[in-house]
Interface confidence: low
C-alpha cells in the first residue's frame, strides 16, 4: 500500500482525486488498491508509457480538463479491470493505435471535447465490450468504414458537434445493439439510404443542426424501436411519403427550422405514441384534410412561424387528445367554422400574428375546455355574437392589436368584455381603430353613442352571461396555465445535446410576459 500523493486527496484510499495547475505529471506513488482515479484541471500535457502500471485494480479513470495533447501507446497498459475511461476536455489531436489495447473490461470511453481530426478502425478494434463511446465536440471530418465494426455491444454513440460532411452507409452496420446515436451539429448534407438499416434497437437518433436536404424514402424503415427522432434545423424541403411509416414507438419528433413547404395526408404515422410535433419555422403554406389523422395521442402541435394561408376543414381530424395548438405567425385570413370541431380536449390555441378578418360564430363550438385563446395582431373588426359564451374554463383571451370597428355592432362584444375584463390581461387592452374619432380608445369603455352619433343605438341586448363575474377572488389560479408549454422548444433529455433552444423562448409560442414568469 502506498500513501496518497501530496497533490491528491484520497478517500478510503480506493478513490483518488488529483487536481490543480501545479500538477504537470501523473502523481506518484498512487495507492495500489485505487479503484477510481480522477486527474482534473491540471497542466499535464503528456501521458508517458505505463504511468498506471501499479494500480491494476482501477475501475474508473477520469483525466479531464487538462492540457493533455500527447499520449504514448502504452499509457493504459495493465488496466485490464478498467470499465470507465474519460479523456474528455483535453487537447488531443491524435490517438495512437493500440492505445486501448488490453482494456478488455472497458465499457465507457469518453473522448469528447478534444481536437481529434480522425479515427481509424484500429483504434477501437480491441474494445469489444464497449457500451458507450463519446466522440462529440471534436474535429472529425469523416468516419471510415470499419471504425466501429468491432463494437458490437455498443449502446450509445455520440458523434455530435464534429465536422462530418458525409456518412458512409456501412459505418454503423454492425451496431445492432445501439440504442442512442447522435450526429447533431455536423455538416451532413444527406444520409445515404441503408445507413441506419442495421440499427434495429435504436431508440434515439439525433440529426438536428446539419444541412440535410433530402431524406431517402426508406431511411428509417428498419428502426422500429425508435422513440426520439430529432431532424430540426436542417434544410429538409420535403418528406418522402413513407418516411415515418415504420416508427410505431416514436414519441418525440422535431422538424422545426427546416424548409418544408407541404405536408401530405398520412405522412405522419401511424405513430400511436407521439405526444408532441414541432413544425414551426418551416415554409408550410396549407394543411390538407387528415394530415395528422394517425396521431391519436398527440397533445402538442406547433405550426407557428410558417406561411399557412389555408387550413382544410378536416386538417385536424383524429387529434382528439390535442391540448395545445399553435398557429401563430402565419398568413391565415379565414378559418372554416368546423376546423377545430374535432379538438374536444384543446386547452390552448394561439392564432396571433395572422391576417384573420373574421371568425365564424361556431369556430370554438365543440372546444369547450379552451383555457387560453390568442387572437392579437390580426385584422379582426368584430366577433360573432356569443362566440365565447360556452367556454366556461376560458381564463386568458388576447384581443389587442386588431382594427376593432367601434360602431353599434360592437356592443355585444364590448358588454361581454366588460363582464370578463380580467380574462383580457393587464398588459394590453383592445382599442378601437374606427371610426376615426374614437381611434385609440379602449374598446371596453368606449361610449358607442359618441363613436357613431348618427346611428340609433338599440338597448344593450341581454348577452348571455358566462359563469364568470369580475370578482377576482373567485377565479381559479391561472398563472401557470400553459406557462411552460409554448415557452421553449422541446428540450432534449440529455445534457450534451444543447442545440434545440430557441433564441426568444416566447417567440415560438407567443406567450405573454405574464405567462412567462
Amino acid at each position: 500500500y502506498y500513501g496518497c500523493p501530496s497533490e491528491c486527496t484520497c478517500s478510503r484510499a480506493s478513490q483518488v482525486e488529483c487536481t490543480g495547475a501545479r500538477i504537470v505529471a501523473v502523481p506518484t506513488p498512487l495507492p495500489w488498491n485505487a479503484m477510481s482515479l480522477q486527474i482534473l484541471n491540471t497542466h499535464i500535457t503528456e501521458l508517458s508509457e505505463s504511468p498506471f502500471l501499479n494500480i491494476s485494480a482501477l475501475i474508473a479513470l477520469r483525466i479531464e480538463k487538462n492540457e493533455l495533447s500527447h499520449i504514448m501507446p502504452g499509457a493504459f497498459r495493465n488496466l485490464g479491470s478498467l470499465r470507465y475511461l474519460s479523456l474528455a476536455n483535453n487537447k488531443l489531436q491524435v490517438l495512437p493505435i493500440g492505445l486501448f489495447q488490453g482494456l478488455d473490461s472497458l465499457e465507457s470511453l469518453l473522448l469528447s471535447s478534444n481536437q481529434l481530426v480522425q479515427i481509424q478502425p484500429a483504434h477501437f478494434s480491441q474494445c469489444s465490450n464497449l457500451k458507450e463511446l463519446q466522440l462529440h465536440g471534436n474535429h472529425l471530418e469523416y468516419i471510415p468504414d470499419g471504425a466501429f465494426d468491432h463494437l458490437v455491444g455498443l449502446t450509445k454513440l455520440n458523434l455530435g458537434k464534429n465536422s462530418l460532411t458525409h456518412i458512409s452507409p456501412r459505418v454503423f452496420q454492425h451496431l445492432g445493439n445501439l440504442q442512442v446515436l447522435r450526429l447533431y451539429e455536423n455538416r451532413l448534407t444527406d444520409i445515404p439510404m441503408g445507413t441506419f438499416d442495421g440499427l434495429v434497437n435504436l431508440q434515439e437518433l439525433a440529426l438536428q443542426q446539419n444541412q440535410i436536404g433530402l431524406l431517402s424514402p426508406g431511411l428509417f424503415h428498419n428502426n422500429h424501436n425508435l422513440q426520439r427522432l430529432y431532424l430540426s434545423n436542417n434544410h429538409i424541403s420535403q418528406l418522402p411519403p413513407s418516411i415515418f411509416m415504420q416508427l410505431p414507438q416514436l414519441n418525440r419528433l422535431t422538424l422545426f427550422g427546416n424548409s418544408l413547404k407541404e405536408l401530405s395526408p398520412g405522412i405522419f404515422g401511424p405513430m400511436p405514441n407521439l405526444r408532441e410535433l414541432w413544425l414551426y419555422d418551416n415554409h408550410i403554406t396549407s394543411l390538407p384534410d387528415n394530415v395528422f389523422s394517425n396521431l391519436r395521442q398527440l397533445q402538442v402541435l406547433i405550426l407557428s412561424r410558417n406561411q399557412i394561408s389555408f387550413i382544410s376543414p378536416g386538417a385536424f381530424n383524429g387529434l382528439t387528445e390535442l391540448r395545445e395548438l399553435s398557429l401563430h405567425t402565419n398568413a391565415l385570413q379565414d378559418l372554416d367554422g368546423n376546423v377545430f370541431r374535432m379538438l374536444a380536449n384543446l386547452q390552448n390555441i394561439s392564432l396571433q400574428n395572422n391576417r384573420l378578418r373574421q371568425l365564424p360564430g361556431n369556430i370554438f363550438a365543440n372546444v369547450n375546455g379552451l383555457m387560453t385563446i390568442q387572437l392579437q395582431n390580426n385584422q379582426l373588426e368584430n366577433l360573432p355574437l356569443g362566440i365565447f359564451d360556452h367556454l366556461g374554463k376560458l381564463c386568458e383571451l388576447r384581443l389587442y392589436d386588431n382594427p376593432w370597428r367601434c360602431d353599434s355592432d360592437i356592443l355585444p362584444l364590448r358588454n361581454w368584455l366588460l363582464l370578463n375584463q380580467p380574462r383580457l390581461g393587464t398588459d394590453t387592452v383592445p382599442v378601437c381603430f374606427s371610426p376615426a374619432n374614437v381611434r385609440g380608445q379602449s374598446l371596453i369603455i368606449i361610449n358607442v353613442n359618441v363613436a357613431v352619433p348618427s346611428v340609433h343605438v338599440p338597448e344593450v341586448p341581454s348577452y348571455p352571461e358566462t359563469s364568470w363575474y369580475p370578482d377576482t377572488s373567485s377565479y381559479p389560479d391561472t398563472t401557470s396555465i400553459s406557462s411552460t408549454t409554448e415557452l421553449t422548444s422541446p428540450v432534449e433529455d440529455y445534457t450534451d445535446l444543447t442545440t434545440i433552444q430557441v433564441t426568444d423562448d416566447r417567440s415560438v409560442w407567443g406567450m405573454t410576459q405574464a405567462q412567462s414568469g
Epitope: 481509424q120 478502425p121 471510415p144 468504414d145 470499419g146 444527406d190 445515404p192 433530402l214 431517402s216 424514402p217
Partner: antibody, heavy 119, light 111 residues
C-alpha cells in the same frame, strides 16, 4: 496534376493469377479511394473493388469476392489489384481510378492495363 | 446485365440537345445524391463529366448538365458538337453488396 500510371499489358493462362499496379503522383494518396474498374472488349464498365489507404480495409464487389485482392502501399503511393483463378472471360482492360472515399466518383483514371487470358 | 439501365444509343445533330437517362432503384440512384457520368472515347480511359448528380468538375463544358428525379438520373448535352460523340456511362453509389454500380453505357452519335 494527379497522375495514375499502371503497369503494362499481361498475357495469362487460365487458372493463373495476375497482379496489376497503379502508381499515384501529384496528390494525397492516403485519403482517396483507389478503385479498380474493368472493361471487357466491346462491353461496359464494371467495378471490382476499392481501397482507401488510410483506412486499410478494401471493399470488393460481390461478384469478385474471394478472387480479387486489393492492397495499397502508402510508402510508394502504389495500389495493387490481384485477380486469381483467371478464366477467358476475365480478358479485359483493367483501370485504376481515384475518387473520394465516401462516394466513389472517379475523377482521375489510369491509362488502363490489358490482361489477356488465353490458353 | 448492368445494374443501371441506359438506352443503348442516342443521336443528335450538331447544335441540338440530347438527354441520356439512367434508371436504377431506391437502393442506388434513388437513395443517394451520388450519381456520376463518364465520357469514354474509343481506346481511351473514361473521363468524369458530372458528379453528385449535377456538379461539373473544372474543365468540363457547361454544355453538360445532370439531374435526378426519383430513381432516374439524366445527362443533358446541349449544343451538340462532333467531339461529343462517345460512349457515356452513368454510375451510382449503391446500398447493396456492391458499393458502385455502372450503367451499360450509351453510344452517342453526332449526325
Amino acid at each position: 496534376q494527379v497522375q495514375l500510371v499502371q503497369s503494362g499489358a499481361e498475357v495469362k493462362k487460365p487458372g493463373s493469377s495476375v497482379k496489376v499496379s497503379c502508381k499515384a503522383s501529384g496528390g494525397t494518396f492516403s485519403t482517396y479511394a483507389i478503385s479498380w474498374v474493368r472493361q471487357a472488349p466491346g462491353q461496359g464498365l464494371e467495378w471490382m473493388g476499392g481501397i482507401t489507404p488510410m483506412f486499410g480495409t478494401p471493399n470488393y464487389a460481390q461478384k469478385f469476392q474471394g478472387r480479387v485482392t486489393i492492397t495499397a502501399d502508402e510508402s510508394t503511393s502504389t495500389a495493387y489489384m490481384e485477380l486469381s483463378s483467371l478464366r477467358s472471360e476475365d480478358t479485359a482492360v483493367y483501370y485504376c481510378a481515384r475518387g473520394d472515399w465516401y462516394d466513389y466518383h472517379f475523377d482521375y483514371w489510369g491509362q488502363g492495363t490489358l490482361v489477356t487470358v488465353s490458353s | 446485365q448492368s445494374a443501371l439501365t441506359q438506352p443503348a444509343s442516342v443521336s443528335g445533330s450538331p447544335g441540338q440537345s440530347i438527354t441520356i437517362s439512367c434508371t436504377g432503384t431506391s437502393s442506388d440512384v434513388g437513395g443517394y445524391n451520388y450519381v456520376s457520368w463518364y465520357q469514354q472515347h474509343p481506346g481511351k480511359a473514361p473521363k468524369l463529366m458530372i458528379y453528385e448528380v449535377s456538379n461539373r468538375p473544372s474543365g468540363v463544358s457547361n454544355r453538360f448538365s445532370g439531374s435526378k428525379s426519383g430513381n432516374t438520373a439524366s445527362l443533358t448535352i446541349s449544343g451538340l458538337q462532333a467531339e461529343d460523340e462517345a460512349d457515356y456511362y452513368c454510375q451510382s453509389y449503391a446500398n447493396r453488396d456492391n458499393f458502385v454500380v455502372f450503367g451499360g453505357g450509351t453510344k452517342l452519335t453526332v449526325l
